[in-house]
Interface confidence: low
């Protein structure tokens, strides 16, 4: 049977039994081999107990005495089989053996769970020689036990290539429950069930679990570890923890926050990065994500003109990189812009609206009724037109650009003239005689150059020909009017 000792038991006497005189005080060891020193253990367990020698793993010496009597089998004395103690306490345990003096160089090694204990362990071997035998006592001490010290300890001795092994000494370190799995923070959907897991171990077992929500116990009766708490759903943020209980006391897990996923806060810092006539580049800083990643964003644009009845334009874009170029806008217009972003729960409110303006645009219409005729007396070409019906958004007219192309005998030459905004006529010098002159006119604003009018062609004859009639912008359908004068 396994002998068990609890830490509150009285220590055994140091050397009970079978040595003659029980090793009186004047019988000091000849040799002491300490691996560590200076430790007074809180618990000490003796090497032997009354009873028969251990016969499990023995060495039968072949040497006989003068009287030819066989020596008794060599075996470690029985010792305490099971030591139970609390974490951080000290413990000392021994194994002992009596070895006939005919054997030399006997050493004892300590093993734990099948592995030899080497290095800086607190092991001491003491030798007590007598006339025929030497009592060897191997002590092993641990100053402050930890859970990792749990296990089965044995002594081994080699004699004549035979290995003698002691009975195991089982060390059981008990303490407060130790968590192997604690609940984790989560972001959950409102009123949707979710699970939390808590697992703790001893020894001592069993370990029982209580769940705590916002400082109040959830379950009246404990659950054996591991425990899974199914929460049917929350409507607001809560903090959960679990308590692990065993005979040694209570350990409380970390408190974890369970957040309720919500619609995001609206974006902030909507800023205008760049403006053109028909586009606005905006950026924004996303608001709080509502414990759920952003999916995409929506840019809402409406004309800020109070007289405008234009509907809101919506542009959808990805959540990153918090930048969007709004296109298809009118030139020289004011817009109110707001940004909203969504997560899996829904759309945020729109950000505070900001005012943004597009710049002037180029004219969208060409000058009308372009007429060209030759003034032979001054050797000029006169050009007349009507001002285009420019929209307000096109900006203020600053002038016109006239393109005139001269073609003669395979030679082509284009010239450009800029004309101020006040006039609706221009005069250009004849560049080449016996040639065709093609004229186009475009209106110009600060926003750029508008479309050119349809081409009007006029033939410039050699000197001496008569200027009969003008050439003008054709009616629709006449693609290539040429007037020969």
């Amino acid at each position: 049977a396994i002998t068990e000792a609890r830490e509150e038991a009285k220590p055994y006497p140091l050397f009970p039994g079978p040595f003659p005189g029980s090793l009186q005080t004047d019988h000091t060891p000849l040799l002491s081999l300490p691996h560590a020193s200076g430790y007074q253990p809180a618990l000490m367990f003796s090497p032997t107990q009354p009873g028969r020698p251990h016969t499990g793993n023995v060495a039968i010496p072949q040497v006989t005495s003068v009287e030819s009597k066989p020596l008794p089998p060599l075996a470690f004395k029985h010792t305490v089989g099971h030591i139970i103690l609390s974490e951080h306490k000290g413990v000392k345990f021994n194994c002992s053996i009596s070895v006939p003096n005919i054997y030399q160089d006997t050493t004892i090694s300590w093993w734990k769970d099948g592995k030899e204990l080497l290095g800086a362990h607190h092991a001491i071997t003491q030798f007590y020689p007598d006339d025929e035998v030497t009592a060897i006592i191997a002590s092993f001490s641990i100053t402050s036990v930890q859970r990792s010290d749990n296990g089965s300890y044995i002594c081994k001795m080699k004699i004549n290539n035979e290995e003698i092994v002691s009975d195991p000494i089982y060390i059981e370190v008990q303490g407060l429950p130790h968590f192997t799995k604690q609940p984790e923070s989560m972001n959950v959907t409102r009123n949707t069930a979710f699970n939390l897991t808590c697992q703790a171990v001893g020894p001592p077992e069993p370990v029982n679990i209580f769940w705590v929500q916002n400082s109040s116990r959830v379950n009246e009766q404990p659950e054996k570890s591991p425990s899974v708490l199914t929460v049917p759903g929350l409507t607001e943020m809560a903090v959960f923890s679990c308590e692990a209980h065993n005979d040694k006391g209570l350990t409380v897990s970390k408190g974890v926050q369970i957040n309720i996923k919500a619609i995001p806060s609206p974006p902030t810092e909507v800023s205008i990065r760049n403006s053109t006539a028909h586009s606005i580049l905006i950026s924004w800083v996303p608001g709080f994500d509502g414990y759920s990643p952003f999916r995409n964003c929506s840019i809402q644009v409406k004309e800020a003109d109070p007289l405008s009845n234009g509907s809101v334009m919506i542009f959808n874009t990805s959540a990153l990189p918090h930048l969007y170029q709004i296109k298809q806008l009118q030139a020289l217009a004011n817009y109110s812009i707001g940004v909203s972003c969504m997560n899996e729960i829904g759309w945020s409110a729109v950000s505070p609206w900001i005012l943004a303006s597009t710049t002037e645009g180029a004219p969208s219409v060409a000058p009308l009724n372009v007429t060209v005729f030759l003034n032979e007396s001054s050797d000029n070409v006169d050009i007349r037109w009507m001002k285009p019906p420019t929209k307000q958004q096109d900006g203020e007219l600053v002038g016109y650009r006239i393109s005139h192309v001269w073609q003669s005998a395979g030679i082509s030459k284009e010239l450009l003239e800029e004309v101020g905004q006040n006039g609706s006529r221009a005069r250009i010098s004849v560049q080449v005689h016996n040639a065709t002159c093609t004229v186009r006119i475009a209106a110009v604003t600060r926003g750029g150059v508008g479309p050119f009018s349809d081409p009007v062609k006029i033939f410039i004859p050699a000197h001496g020909w008569v200027d009969y009639a003008p050439s003008s912008t054709p009616a629709p359908g006449n693609a290539d009017p040429v007037l020969i004068i």
Epitope: S265, P266, T268, E269, S271, R273, N274, L281, S283, V285, G287, F288, L320, P321, L323, Q325, A349, P352
Partner: antibody
Framework: EVQLQQSGPELVKPGASVRIPCKAS????????MDWVKQSHGKSLEWIGN????????IYSQKFKGKATLTVDKSSSTAYMELRSLTSEDTAVYYC?????????WGQGTLVTVSA | DIVLTQSPASLTVSLGQRATISCRAS??????????MHWYQQKPGQPPKLLIY???NLESGVPARFSGSRSGTDFTLNIHPVEEEDAATYYC?????????FGSGTKLEIK
């Protein structure tokens, strides 16, 4: 690990220009703005402006409009700040910082000294 | 521009005691439940280091003895207990709108 590597100190003459690189690594360069901050000796910090590498959009503090120009080279994950028409007032340490909620990542700073 | 007024300009605190630095914004830097105020620590020859973002969120890797709070447009950085390595200059900064601005700084000395 996010890293912003700036170049060494620069000594430039008044009226000249200087271009400071900031090479980013450890994150997707185009996902974050790059902000620039000035610190004159013994003084506080001044935000210069930032650039979004994705499309090159920039914004500047009014004080630095016309003084600083921010650009990026996405192929090398490098942001640049050019300072022009330098005067002694521009002598300072210039930092690049990755734009986010607060500037969690900074370059080590480039000291620009303007001296004849 | 939003002006950030930081006080005091310098502060001497005994080891283990509490250091309190204030930053007042000339107008709100808060919206939608978030305050766009951040705190930095800067030591000589080094770039600033983000300590607190969005008024009260501790940046990853920053010791828990640093904390931030807000009351209206007043923001506070607390360091408790102060350690020797906390000797530095501290700045507040907002990112509510462009341009971002910084406070003038508070130099903390440990005695």
């Amino acid at each position: 690990e996010v890293q912003l590597q700036q170049s060494g100190p620069e000594l430039v003459k008044p009226g000249a220009s200087v271009r400071i690189p900031c090479k980013a690594s450890g994150y997707t360069f185009s996902d974050y703005n790059m902000d620039w901050v000035k610190q004159s000796h013994g003084k506080s910090l001044e935000w210069i402006g930032n650039i979004n590498p994705n499309i090159g959009g920039t914004i500047y503090s009014q004080k630095f409009k016309g003084k600083a120009t921010l650009t990026v080279d996405k192929s090398s994950s490098t942001a640049y700040m050019e300072l022009r028409s330098l005067t002694s007032e521009d002598t300072a340490v210039y930092y690049c910082a990755r734009g986010d909620y607060g500037f969690a990542s900074w370059g080590q700073g480039t000291l620009v000294t303007v001296s004849a | 521009d939003i002006v950030l007024t930081q006080s005091p300009a310098s502060l001497t605190v005994s080891l283990g005691q509490r250091a309190t630095i204030s930053c007042r914004a000339s107008r709100s830097v808060s919206t939608s439940g978030y305050s766009y105020m951040h705190w930095y620590q800067q030591k000589p020859g080094q770039p600033p280091k983000l300590l607190i973002y969005l008024a009260s969120n501790l940046e990853s890797g920053v010791p828990a003895r640093f904390s931030g709070s807000r009351s209206g447009t007043d923001f506070t950085l607390n360091i408790h207990p102060v350690e020797e390595e906390d000797a530095a200059t501290y700045y507040c900064q907002h990112s509510r709108e462009y341009p971002f601005t910084f406070g003038s700084g508070t130099k903390l000395e440990i005695k």
